[in-house]
């Protein structure tokens, strides 16, 4: 049983004259959400103000494909993005202040894996450092969630219903309603990534129309009501 002193961790901290990179072991997030991959570093070049490049790569250190890269001009705190895979990666930290933390938007299960941060000083002090172990991103499946359900006017005074749901794996959508054989009329279109949309193209009867989203983790339901009045067509939802 060891004893330590966190109120005096200076004793355990990286000496001013060496490189070190700090990342957590793991970051957990649900598919469809965003996640922050933290990374901070120390370096031996006191008050370095020259040009720098911040890089994140996936898979393996030093050789894995880059998913993000930005460069900061001498004296600038703005790191100009040069690469952001699928536009989903953005720097949250400030490399000038030893923070390379990265935000990943719209996570998919395929984003799971290990990520490695790297900083390169490209001025007089030509130096670079990369995390060896990286941070593991665990993207977990998400139960379905209906994010939008609506009735819209269609052609020839008809109405159509739209249902958008998200989940990972992408949920299967089904419509049910007062019309006979109603659910077979649903047109399912793939949205982006973890979102799917299903359309019921012609609502022929008044009543309640229910959209059901289901995947291996669960199911979600939402309903919309159609009431047409004799004077002027309309809906109540």
């Amino acid at each position: 049983d060891a004893s330590g002193d966190l109120l005096n961790t200076e004793a355990h901290s990286a000496p001013a004259q060496r490189w070190s990179m700090q990342v957590p072991a793991e970051v957990n997030a649900e598919a469809g959400d965003a996640a922050v991959l933290p990374c901070t570093f120390t370096h031996p070049h006191r008050h370095y103000d020259g040009p720098l490049t911040a890089i994140w790569r996936s898979g393996e250190p030093y050789a894995g494909p880059q998913v993000f890269r930005c460069t900061a001009a001498p004296g600038s705190e703005l790191c100009q993005t040069a690469l952001s895979l699928h536009g989903r990666f953005r720097l949250l930290g400030n490399p000038r202040r030893n923070d390379l933390s990265l935000r990943v938007e719209r996570l998919a299960l395929a984003d799971s894996g290990r990520y490695f941060c790297r900083v390169e000083f490209t001025g007089d002090a030509h130096d670079r450092y990369e995390s060896r172990h990286g941070v593991r991103l665990r993207v977990t499946a998400a139960a379905p969630r209906i994010v939008n359900i609506s009735v819209l006017p269609g052609p020839a005074h008809a109405f159509r219903a739209l249902c958008t749901a998200e989940g990972e794996p992408p949920p299967a959508l089904a419509w049910s309603g007062p019309a006979p054989g109603n659910s077979s009329a649903a047109l399912q279109g793939q949205g982006h990534g973890y979102q799917v949309t299903a359309e019921l193209p012609a609502l022929t009867r008044d009543g309640r129309y229910t959209c059901t989203a289901a995947n291996s983790l669960g199911r979600a339901e939402a309903s919309v009501y159609l009431f047409r009045f004799h004077g002027a067509p309309g809906t109540s939802t």
Epitope: D1, A2, G4, L6, L7, T9, E10, H12, S13, A14, S20, Q22, V23, P24, A25, E26, V27, N28, V36, P38, T40, T42, L92, G93, N94, R97, N98, D99, S101, H133, R138
Partner: antibody
Framework: QVQLVQSGAEVKKPGASVKVSCKAS????????MHWVRQAPGQGLEWMGW????????NYAQRFQGRVTMTRDTSISTAYMELSRLRSDDTAVYYC?????????????????WGQGTSVTVSS | DIVMTQSPDSLAVSLGERATINCKSS????????????LAWYQQKPGQPPKLLIY???TRESGVPDRFSGSGSGTDFTLTISSLQAEDVAVYYC?????????FGQGTKLEIK
């Protein structure tokens, strides 16, 4: 010695926002993460997120995303946590707590000094 | 997210006796790169903020009496108070800092029998 002093108790209506402050002393404010943790009446501890006072980088727990904002003012060594669109189940004591030393080799992100807590009551 | 489960929920122990609190994580918090368990224990007395007791599963924080000790690895951890004192009455929490978001156990209330 390390001290974190928080602002006083607040009573808010549902839908309103609350901003809690945490003034640090006895150490270099920009050398350590600052965490926010809350505790509902008679309940356990819930991590809300952190701010890196050196870089202003933040990391929020997913359930608070879009409602919480953590900021800091390095000139007065103070961290802030603002929670918006308050609901009755946000009624809790909110703590700031000092986290990891940024220069430490390992990711030792435990909370070794805590504020006294700020009671936030949300009631109509 | 990693779920931390403590047992028992409450515990009554006589003064001078040993108190044992268990904490189980839903996944391992042992990091193979440095062979460290990313687990901490906190003590919270009524009306006070929590206080750090132990980190890395078994390293006692400075100023914490040596009757407090932590053990375990991977998913199963134990906080032991070798000889209970009156001032040890509190709620004890385990916390993992291996995986973000950080999570705490539900707490174990320790009372005197």
């Amino acid at each position: 010695q390390v001290q974190l002093v928080q602002s006083g108790a607040e009573v808010k209506k549902p839908g309103a926002s609350v901003k809690v402050s945490c003034k640090a002393s006895g150490y270099t404010f920009t050398d350590y993460y600052m965490h926010w943790v809350r505790q509902a009446p008679g309940q356990g501890l819930e991590w809300m997120g952190w701010i890196n006072p050196n870089s202003d980088g933040t990391n929020y727990a997913q359930r608070f995303q879009g409602r919480v904002t953590m900021t800091r003012d390095t000139s007065i060594s103070t961290a802030y946590m603002e929670l918006s669109r308050l609901r009755s189940d946000d009624t809790a004591v909110y703590y700031c707590a000092r986290g990891r030393l940024l220069r430490f080799f390992d990711w030792l992100d435990v909370m070794d000094a805590w504020g006294q807590g700020t009671s936030v009551t949300v009631s109509s | 997210d990693i779920v931390m489960t403590q047992s028992p929920d409450s515990l009554a122990v006589s003064l001078g006796e040993r108190a044992t609190i268990n904490c189980k994580s839903s996944r391992s918090v042992l990091y193979s790169s440095n062979n460290k368990n990313y687990l901490a224990w906190y003590q919270q007395k009524p009306g006070q903020p929590p206080k750090l007791l132990i980190y890395w599963a078994s390293t006692r924080e400075s100023g914490v009496p040596d009757r407090f000790s932590g053990s375990g690895s991977g998913t199963d951890f134990t906080l032991t108070i070798s000889s209970l004192q009156a001032e040890d009455v509190a709620v004890y929490y385990c916390q993992q800092y291996y995986s973000i978001p950080y999570t705490f156990g539900q707490g174990t209330k320790l009372e005197i029998k």
